[in-house]
């Protein structure tokens, strides 16, 4: 099906700013520096193609990508199918975040990306440092006290952590729109569950201790578990599709070159190991440093602390997929009753993990709801 791909989309070689301006949208690019020195690229689409004349403050919407991904996820389809452009055209001030370690967040004031120290992070640090730094920056820049937060996949994970542990940050979130939410991964069918019993020393031995490349570990599973589904050598070697799963039925294959050229955008081996710990434990908790002594050094306790989503009072709307391998419906089922301020939930029976960002019918199934919920919030 996609065995021989001839890149036809110019966005294949573009950065985020170029992708935005290519479609005729205004773009502002900023660098946000976190407390621990990571430099994150943040992009802004301040208005849409047809509403630049509208004066007054526009509600701010911040989009946060998921695991192994980047801000390009929100602008990889045609404008009428990409959430960032849809929101801009609907009159919102749209901001796109990047998590440390990805293509657009691979610099640090103190460490080179060639060093092991640079890659010593997991989603804990994204929640503790990246989100507060980015949200504080947006709040200062726009002069608005609150913003709407849209997260996908790990973007919801770091939202759950940040907004339940950092009350002053939580106050800045008007509504949390969670797409394919991930807290526990007890029931995940993703190939990351194959890694759950690999000890840390062996994990690092196989994958190294810097950026995560899938290596040849996953090859043994692909023929039977991924690629037999009418698939193709190109997707089969891509870590994002390997880990998140794939289904061609709802997928614009003409955009595949864009998806593949921008993904996986990179994360740390430590982050991937954290995810395997979560699969093994079935709990939503901080990174386990491997021994009670090391955990005490980091947490003042012998076990990594649990994250308590019941402490998050931010209003939250949730969309999940019935065919999602990573955010399994059973895990979502465990999450929903713990959310004290759940205002909306929709399960899309045929959706998988990546459909929330790339499906051809995502506007009808998800995005239009978000646009109208934000506009209701305005009143």
């Amino acid at each position: 099906l996609f065995g021989k791909l001839h890149p036809g989309s110019p966005e294949v070689t573009m950065n985020i700013s170029q992708m935005i301006t290519y479609w005729g949208y205004p773009n502002e690019e900023y660098e946000v520096v976190t407390e621990d020195g990571y430099i994150l690229e943040v992009n802004r689409i301040p208005y849409g193609k047809k509403n630049s004349g509208n004066t007054g403050q526009r509600p701010v919407v911040f989009l946060q990508h998921g695991l192994l991904a980047s801000a390009t996820n929100w602008i990889s389809n045609l404008p009428n199918n990409s959430l960032a452009f849809i929101l801009a055209d609907a009159g919102y001030d749209v901001w796109l975040g990047n998590s440390r370690g990805n293509t657009w967040a691979r610099r640090n004031l103190y460490y080179s990306p060639d060093s092991v120290e640079f890659w010593a992070f997991s989603f804990d640090e994204m929640a503790k440092y990246d989100l507060p730094a980015t949200i504080d920056f947006i709040v200062k820049k726009t002069g608005q006290k609150q913003l709407h937060y849209v997260g996908h996949s790990q973007g919801t994970t770091i939202g759950f952590i940040a907004f339940s542990t950092n009350p002053s940050l939580a106050k800045r979130i008007k509504t949390f729109y969670a797409l394919a939410p991930v807290a526990t991964v007890k029931y995940t069918k993703s190939l990351i569950n194959k890694l759950r019993f690999v000890p840390q020393s062996l994990f690092k031995f196989i994958f190294g201790d810097k950026i995560f490349y899938p290596h040849n570990f996953f090859d043994q599973f692909l023929a039977t578990e991924v690629c037999s589904r009418e698939m193709l050598n190109l997707l089969c070697s891509n870590a994002l599709f390997i880990i998140c799963g794939f289904d061609s039925k709802n997928f614009n294959t003409s955009r595949l070159d864009v998806y593949l050229s921008h993904n996986p955008a990179g994360t740390s081996v430590q982050n991937m190991f954290h995810w395997t710990q979560a699969v093994k434990s079935g709990k939503f908790q901080a990174y386990d440093w491997g021994s009670p002594v090391q955990n005490r050094m980091h947490y003042d306790q012998s076990q990594p602390p649990y994250y308590n989503v019941t402490a998050m009072n931010v209003p939250i709307a949730v969309w999940n997929g019935g065919k999602d391998l990573l955010a399994d419906p059973q895990d979502v089922g465990l999450l929903l009753p713990k959310l004290p301020n759940l205002i909306y939930h929709k399960e899309i029976p045929f959706y998988n993990h990546l459909d929330f960002i790339w499906a051809m019918d995502a506007p009808q199934e998800v995005y239009n709801d978000i646009v109208s919920m934000i506009s209701e919030d305005k009143k």
Epitope: F197, L202, D219
Partner: nanobody, 115 residues
Framework: QVQLQESGGGLVQTGGSLRLSCAAS????????LSWYRQAPGKQREPVAA???????TYADSVKGRFTISRDNIKNTMYLQMNSLTPEDTGVYYC?????????WGQGTQVTVSS
């Protein structure tokens, strides 16, 4: 519960060779990763070689070009061929297997390289 049992260790002179074997009580064909670890005197146990189900291998820098990990699915046995041994290779060698149900260890076999 898979049981693993190493054999083939012993005393060898510098420059010599040994072949370690690891026999499994169950199928090693279903293991995602087969590995050999070394615990040198006074040090932590660390991996020296790993073999993925796909057939790809990874070696510690200190043994690259000298050690070879392999498997025989019919005999349910994995091997570590060790050539050009040096005193730094001395230690207890453990085989390990990682599969869908867990990570399994052997009891270890002593390898001593004399100068």
């Amino acid at each position: 519960q898979v049981q693993l049992q190493e054999s083939g260790g012993g005393l060898v002179q510098t420059g010599g060779s040994l072949r370690l074997s690891c026999a499994a009580s169950g199928s090693i064909g279903s293991m995602y990763v087969l590995s050999w670890y070394r615990q040198a005197p006074g040090k932590q146990r660390e991996p020296v070689a790993a073999l993925m189900g796909s057939g790809s291998t990874t070696y510690a820098d200190s043994v690259k070009g000298r050690f070879t990990i392999s498997r025989d699915n019919i005999k349910n046995t994995m091997y570590l061929q060790m050539n050009s041994l040096t005193p730094e290779d001395t230690g207890v060698y453990y085989c390990a297997g990682t599969g869908a149900e867990g990570h399994y260890w052997g009891q270890g076999t002593q390898v001593t390289v004399s100068s």
